[in-house]
């Protein structure tokens, strides 16, 4: 069954998955997919990274870690109820039948209101955004810094962004994460 | 458009080799996953196996999996199956098939017109 | 592996008829089903992949449904073209499979 993970309307939804490069930039592809993992690859396909670099993706879908490392997890942006259900990460390691696959299970609750942090400064530069275009890239992407238009519904998310970091860590350090070589 | 050609097929004793190949041409070859499937003399179909891309990834069921292999050359548009050990189960109308992957997998939404195996003493 | 048990093996039928022909799967597969025509001495031929999405070029009177374990293909307004043989298949997991398939005959 699919291990599963939660976020609320209007904020974005953190789905862990990693693996460990056999050497620094030696990645594999990987894909993700809104629905399960079929036969091959992915279906319903939002993001995929290449050998080298992320290689198509969708609007709100991005990588917030860093995946030259390994850590594939997949952000979506400004989730609605729509996007519940189930995603498919795939590490697909060269050789016979060495694919990895992974299902995990989204659940979008209905929005709380949330008190507001003060200070944005500290939130960007801890997530500093990543802005990507619907595509097949790879299209420049930039790094922002401090965005004077951001919003509050930006700044809790990023505040959920920092406390799932930890439970990305402690997925990390618990072994949820996939050896090559 | 879109055409796969094989060939290689013919008569084979049990136990014999065979290789065969599938030519590909009318889409960039190097785009898409491509598969083997077979058909029994009974008309049912059978998935022999699969191949990524760029080659680097490859699939097989139970009943093929340590006999026989598939490979591509993205440089040559060629897809190819090497049989070894054959057996007379083997025996099938063997066909190429391409599958689109990039934004959704979908399987075999091409086929050749397949290439005759008999295995037989 | 995942048996895909296909009925009828055989089906009669007339121009201009409606036709559905089964596929029930014996693990859970999601949406993942394909299905294709087959003519005498011919390859097979995409219809519907994702269980209900037609491929280009294929005619709006063939409909697939379901998801889960059972799904169908339906023929309505059917034509002497469609008279052939058809096949599901399975790709939610490995095995790849298929039915065993069901001809489609006319009266």
């Known amino acids: 069954s699919e291990v599963e993970y939660r976020a609320e309307v209007g904020q974005n939804a953190y789905l862990p998955c990693f693996y460990t490069p056999a050497a620094p930039g030696n990645l594999v592809p990987v894909c993700w997919g809104k629905g399960a993992c079929p036969v091959f690859e992915c279906g319903n396909v939002v993001l995929r990274t290449d050998e080298r670099d992320v290689n198509y993706w969708t609007s709100r879908y991005w990588l917030n870690g860093d995946f030259r490392k390994g850590d594939v997890s997949l952000t979506i942006e400004n989730v609605t109820l729509a996007d519940s259900g189930i995603y498919c990460c795939r590490i697909q390691i060269p050789g016979i039948m060495n694919d990895e696959k992974f299902n995990l299970k989204l659940v979008i609750k209905p929005a709380k209101v949330t008190p507001a942090p003060t200070r944005q400064r500290d939130f960007t530069a801890a997530f500093p955004r990543m802005l990507t275009t619907r595509g097949h890239g790879p299209a420049e992407t930039q790094t922002l810094g401090s965005l004077p238009d951001i919003n509050l519904t930006q700044i809790s998310t990023l505040a959920n962004e920092l406390r799932d970091s930890r439970l990305a860590n402690d997925l990390r350090d618990s072994g949820a994460t996939i050896r090559i070589g | 458009q879109v055409q796969l050609q094989e060939s290689g097929g013919g008569l084979v004793k049990p136990g014999g080799s065979l290789k065969l190949s599938c030519a590909a041409s009318g889409f960039t070859f190097s785009s898409y996953y491509m598969s083997w499937v077979r058909q029994t003399p009974d008309k049912r179909l059978e998935w022999v196996a699969t191949?990524?891309?760029?080659?680097?990834?490859?699939y097989y069921p139970d009943s093929v999996k340590d006999r026989f292999t598939i490979s591509r050359d993205n440089a040559k548009n060629t897809l190819y199956l090497q049989m070894s050990s054959l057996k007379s189960e083997d025996t099938a109308m063997y066909y190429c098939?391409?599958?689109?992957?990039?934004?959704?997998?979908?399987?075999?939404?091409?086929w050749g017109q397949g290439t005759m195996v008999t295995v037989s003493s | 592996s995942i048996v895909m048990t296909q009925t009828p093996k055989f089906m009669s039928t007339s121009v201009g008829d409606r036709v559905s022909v089964t596929c029930k799967a014996s693990?859970?597969?999601?949406?993942?089903v394909a299905w294709y025509q087959q003519k005498p001495g011919q390859s097979p031929k995409p219809l519907i992949y994702s269980a209900s999405t037609r491929h280009t070029g294929v005619p709006a009177r063939f409909t697939g449904s379901g998801s889960g374990t059972d799904f169908t293909l339906t023929i309505s307004n059917v034509q002497s073209e469609d008279l052939a043989e058809y096949f599901c298949a399975q790709y939610s997991s490995s095995p790849l499979t298929f039915g065993a398939g069901t001809k489609l005959e006319l009266k």
């Open positions: 191949i990524s891309n760029s080659g680097g990834s490859t």
């Open positions: 693990q859970y597969v999601d949406t993942y």
């Open positions: 098939a391409r599958d689109p992957y990039y934004t959704n997998y979908v399987p075999m939404d091409y």
